[in-house]
């Protein structure tokens, strides 16, 4: 045996954003003929010798970071990328609004504002059909997501979540959808890839912050966070059952 065994992949099905009360399964996938899988939950560290974890009813205590490894003979693999399992619907939904308007002429600027009834300091903005989310911490009680020089690619349906940085895996219900319409177009735009859209790959299974030039704020550049793996496209539709 030269070098460690390659890491397995860990995925949440159907999604790593799980409404309270819903079911989810975590699956660790290694090469064929693995002797033993170990699935770990972090904080506090605990483990099961299984290649899957079925959670029939999502609870707050299930949220957190998971990773897995496998053993062949006496050798252990590298650990998988960590999977962040997020419980949603823990708090009331925030409100999402567009300023100055949700109908924006092409080339103009618009700010999407996510406001929570709680003093949360973290907000996540999702666009339906995209594999990425815009995420940034904000002081005070609101999060502004400025979109500078709007293009056709920005039109679509957006939702936001809010949460506290002290409990980063317990999120609110999603906001009601906000439809951003980019006006002054000759035809309905197709969903074209932009710098805000990143395919979810093995390496982005653990949300990672990627810089972008497209989105900016008055304070500092906006970051784009690759979304948790396993959301069934189109992205936002997996969560519509929240809006009751």
């Amino acid at each position: 045996q030269s070098g460690p065994l390659p890491k397995p992949s860990l995925q949440a099905q159907p999604s790593s954003l799980v409404p309270l009360g819903q079911s989810v399964i975590l699956r660790c996938q290694g090469p064929p003929d693995v002797d033993l899988y170990r699935l770990e939950k972090l904080k506090p560290e605990k483990y099961e010798d299984q290649d899957f974890l079925f959670i029939p009813t999502m609870e707050r205590s299930n949220a957190g970071r998971y990773r897995c490894s496998y053993q062949n003979g006496s050798h252990w693999s590298l650990p998988s990328d960590q999977l962040e399992l997020i419980a949603t619907g823990v708090y009331a939904k925030p409100s999402l609004s567009a300023h100055p308007s949700s109908a924006v002429p092409q080339g103009r600027d618009v700010t999407l504002k996510c406001q929570s009834p709680y003093s949360f300091d973290e907000f996540v903005l999702y666009k339906e059909g995209d594999t990425g989310s815009y995420k940034r911490p904000e002081k005070w009680y609101r999060a502004n997501f400025p979109i500078i020089t709007v293009t056709a690619a920005h039109s679509g349906t957006y939702r936001c979540y809010s949460f506290s940085s002290s409990s980063p895996y317990l999120w609110s219900a999603p906001s009601d959808p906000l439809v951003l319409v980019v006006t002054g177009l000759s035809a309905t735009p197709s969903q074209v890839p932009t710098e805000e859209s990143f395919p979810v790959t093995e390496s982005s299974r653990r949300p990672s912050i990627l810089p972008t030039n497209k989105i900016s704020t008055t304070e500092k550049p906006m970051n784009i966070t690759a979304s948790p793996e396993g959301l069934s496209p189109p992205f936002g539709f997996a969560h519509q059952h929240y809006a009751k």
């Epitope: 170990r38 939950k41 506090p44 560290e45 605990k46 483990y47 099961e48 010798d49 252990w76």
Partner: antibody, heavy 123, light 112 residues
Framework: QVQLVESGGGLVKPGGSLRLSCAAS????????VSWIRQAPGKGLEWVSA????????QYAESVKGRFTISRDNAKNSLYLQMNSLRAEDTAVYYC????????????????WGQGTLVTVSS | QSVLTQPPSVSGAPGQRVTISCTGS?????????VHWYQQLPGTAPKLLIY???NRPSGVPDRFSGSKSGTSASLAITGLQAEDEADYYC???????????FGGGTKLTVLG
């Protein structure tokens, strides 16, 4: 109450073999990971081997790999350590210890220990 | 050579506060694994003292406390008593080979 009682220690010559036993009581033995941990005279603790509840998951410290075999008999609530090719540096008190468990999860620490059995490897 | 590093000995007078450090690496404590502490009184088996970095099992006095930061952890004992004289071991888990690792142990002497 939880009890772990080791036995089988004694004096053995280098290259010889010995089989240690640990009798468990006061808990559902087959649900728990258990380990062997040793302590050389005047020295610190060294984890030796661990085994999962069903007996299929086993792990060994590098220092004993290929020489020691851990096993269990859940029907007898017993844990075993077969020690072959013994060396002077294997001289120690051998403890069996239970890993803490809560619901379906195992934890990486030991909540109950036996009183230990002394193994002396000397010619 | 133990995987986790502890001072061989510490001492203090009755009523004083002492701390015992435990230093690991990026593959054990630094990989996110918790640190646990055991007390071994002379001639007896080790006993769980602190689990999950800072939690006390029932029956352990609140004079004992633990903390963890980065790749190291520490055990603090306040209001030192004669019966605290013992060996103290830290323990964690190593991600590389999935093995359980201990510190070399620290002998606590209560002076006077």
């Amino acid at each position: 109450q939880v009890q772990l009682v080791e036995s089988g220690g004694g004096l053995v010559k280098p290259g010889g073999s010995l089989r240690l036993s640990c009798a468990a009581s006061g808990f559902s033995f087959g649900d728990y990971y258990v380990s062997w941990i040793r302590q050389a005279p005047g020295k610190g603790l060294e984890w030796v081997s661990a085994i999962g509840g069903s007996g299929s998951a086993v792990q060994y410290a590098e220092s004993v790999k290929g020489r020691f075999t851990i096993s269990r008999d859940n029907a007898k609530n017993s844990l075993y350590l077969q020690m072959n090719s013994l060396r002077a540096e294997d001289t120690a008190v051998y403890y069996c210890a239970r890993h803490y468990r809560e619901f379906r999860w195992h934890y990486y620490y030991f909540d109950y220990w036996g009183q230990g059995t002394l193994v002396t490897v000397s010619s | 050579q133990s995987v986790l590093t502890q001072p061989p000995s510490v001492s203090g007078a009755p009523g004083q506060r002492v701390t015992i450090s435990c230093t690991g690496s990026s593959s054990n404590i630094g990989a996110g694994y918790d640190v646990h502490w055991y007390q071994q009184l002379p001639g007896t088996a080790p006993k769980l003292l602190i689990y999950g970095n800072s939690n006390r099992p029932s029956g352990v006095p609140d004079r004992f406390s633990g903390s963890k930061s980065g790749t190291s952890a520490s055990l603090a004992i306040t209001g030192l008593q004669a019966e605290d004289e013992a060996d103290y071991y830290c323990q964690s888990h190593d991600l590389g080979a999935h093995v359980w690792v201990f510190g070399g142990g620290t002998k606590l002497t209560v002076l006077g």
